[in-house]
Interface confidence: medium
Amino acid sequence: CPVNWLEYEGSCYWFSRSGKSWPEADKYCQLESAHLVVVNSREEQKFIQHHMGPVNTWMGLTDQSGPWKWVDGTDYETGFKNWRPEQPDDWYGHGLGGGEDCAHFTDDGRWNDDVCQRPYRWVCEAARDPAT
């Protein structure tokens, strides 16, 4: 993994210490040849939680185009989920103040949907370079 990135189960992770909106965070990860983190398992969730600190943090899950989708194409419906009770609460309410179309880890690690412009921390994920 690159310097300052952490390795876990064949992927590399970078944890921000500043805040950006979801679109800005998404763009940042892409410029690093990565993507916003996709959570595939309870174990990966625990790893992320351990390193992110108790602060709202964006992940690569959004329903800006309608249904919830992971940025890397991982199937949302059949995949791992860790929403807070009664969340997400704005699936199709996009006319109400723009809706809450982007998912983030809350301070306890569980997920919430929120306004995508909120300046939260974020986590990038990339496949580990096999050569390293």
Epitope: R17, G19, L96, G99, V115, Q117, R118, P119
Partner: antibody, heavy 120, light 107 residues
Framework: QVQLVESGGGVVQPGRSLRLSCVAS????????MHWVRQAPGKGLEWVAV????????NYADSVKGRFTISRDNSKNTLYLQMNSLRAEDTAVYYC?????????????WGQGTTVTVSS | DIQMTQSPSSLSASVGDRVTITCRAS??????LAWFQQKPGKAPKSLIY???SLQSGVPSKFSGSRSGTDFSLTISSLQPEDFATYYC?????????FGPGTKVDIK
């Protein structure tokens, strides 16, 4: 009780510098983001800057970007605003305010304010 | 930047009146809106956060609501101590922005 006390205001000439301080008490300072907000005479409220609980993230209003610097010393429970290249339009009462969260959730507690007058 | 507009800019009311002030955001901010009260020569005081949640210690005569990007602050029965200027504020994204204020004075 939760309290914020600003100091450092005064009369200063255009182009000069001033540093404001805000001392916090009655809560765990290092767990909260902090903001500076100002109010020109007879005008409304204008947000100036925010610093996250741990100092990792700082954001500024366009009107002060490049001239003002927000900082904090968690060991002293103190927030600072370094104001350089002051202009007449910076004349205002400056308030520090606590963010209920780490720095992205607005303000819940305000100080009493300190007055800055920029005049030749 | 997100622009906040408030209406009316001022209003005259009598003690006991029900008063409603509205605030509109130029784009979606979810529930990330607060209301503040300010009296002359004093610091602002937080009344409402998250569009409709009452700050601790604030009397229940104050209430907030949201409909899309429109927000309102209602004072159910105006008392002499409520004559002041009221500001809305969005904290959905930086820069944080305030509305221009609504001055509530005695009729």
């Amino acid at each position: 009780q939760v309290q914020l006390v600003e100091s450092g205001g005064g009369v200063v000439q255009p182009g000069r510098s001033l540093r404001l301080s805000c001392v916090a008490s009655g809560f765990t300072f290092s767990s909260h983001g902090m903001h500076w907000v100002r109010q020109a005479p007879g005008k409304g409220l204008e947000w100036v800057a925010v610093i996250w609980y741990d100092g990792s993230n700082k954001n500024y209003a366009d009107s002060v970007k490049g001239r003002f610097t927000i900082s904090r010393d968690n060991s002293k429970n103190t927030l600072y605003l370094q104001m350089n290249s002051l202009r007449a339009e910076d004349t205002a009462v400056y308030y520090c305010a606590r963010d209920p969260s780490v720095g992205y959730d607005g303000m819940d507690v305000w100080g009493q304010g300190t007055t800055v007058t920029v005049s030749s | 930047d997100i622009q906040m507009t408030q209406s009316p800019s001022s209003l005259s009311a009598s003690v006991g009146d029900r008063v409603t002030i509205t605030c509109r955001a130029s784009q979606g901010i979810g529930n990330h809106l607060a209301w503040f009260q300010q009296k002359p020569g004093k610091a602002p005081k937080s009344l409402i956060y998250a569009a409709s949640s009452l700050q601790s210690g604030v009397p229940s005569k104050f209430s907030g609501s949201r409909s899309g990007t429109d927000f309102s602050l209602t004072i159910s029965s105006l008392q002499p101590e409520d004559f002041a200027t009221y500001y809305c504020q969005q904290y959905s994204n930086y820069p944080v922005t305030f509305g221009p204020g609504t001055k509530v004075d005695i009729k």
